[in-house]
């Protein structure tokens, strides 16, 4: 079996981002996203 080892040589930082749902759609409340390495992934 192949073994995968992640060793990129640099640290990837992540940051929680918050958006207002009413400003990006039609719902109320807040949307929580996660930015990893400059890309919003969730």
């Amino acid at each position: 079996d192949a073994e995968f080892r992640h060793d990129s040589g640099y640290e990837v930082h992540h940051q929680k981002l918050v958006f207002f749902a009413e400003d990006v759609g039609s719902n109320k409340g807040a949307i929580i996203g996660l930015m990893v390495g400059g890309v919003v992934i969730a």
Epitope: K16, V18, F19, F20, E22, D23, V24, A30, G33
Partner: nanobody
Framework: EVQLVESGGGLVQPGGSLRLSCAAS????????MGWFRQAPGKEREFVAA????????YYADSVKGRFALSRDNAKNTVFLQMNTLKPEDTAEYLC?????????????????WGQGTQVTVSS
């Protein structure tokens, strides 16, 4: 020219209250999320709270949730930050900021315009 002018800061004892105001001019107020950040000496700028362009949604940092309340008056282009049960760790310069609606609300880089700040000191 866009201007954000904060007022209402001062010295207050622990457990006390303050109400900060931010008056905006030179922008279409109803298109902007309004936020408050704070910065203590030697520390990074910290998100405090934000309110949506319509005023229908607010969001607070965990550190102030349940103690601070943010509101806005779109007729007067003004936002208000009611701060209750203040603690010494709330001591900082408080800055009002405006971000075009739709951008992330809890990061300073989203905010196009900033006020000069008002100092809040919580001490006995």
């Amino acid at each position: 020219e866009v201007q954000l002018v904060e007022s209402g800061g001062g010295l207050v004892q622990p457990g006390g209250s303050l109400r900060l105001s931010c008056a905006a001019s030179g922008l279409t107020f109803t298109l902007y999320t309004m936020g408050w950040f704070r910065q203590a000496p030697g520390k990074e700028r910290e998100f405090v709270a934000a309110i949506s362009a319509s005023g229908g949604t607010t969001y607070y940092a965990d550190s102030v949730k349940g103690r601070f309340a943010l509101s806005r008056d779109n007729a007067k282009n003004t936002v208000f930050l009611q701060m209750n049960t203040l603690k010494p760790e709330d001591t900082a310069e408080y800055l009002c900021a405006a971000a075009f609606r739709g951008f992330a609300i809890n990061t300073p880089t989203s905010y196009n315009y900033w006020g000069q700040g008002t100092q809040v000191t919580v001490s006995s």
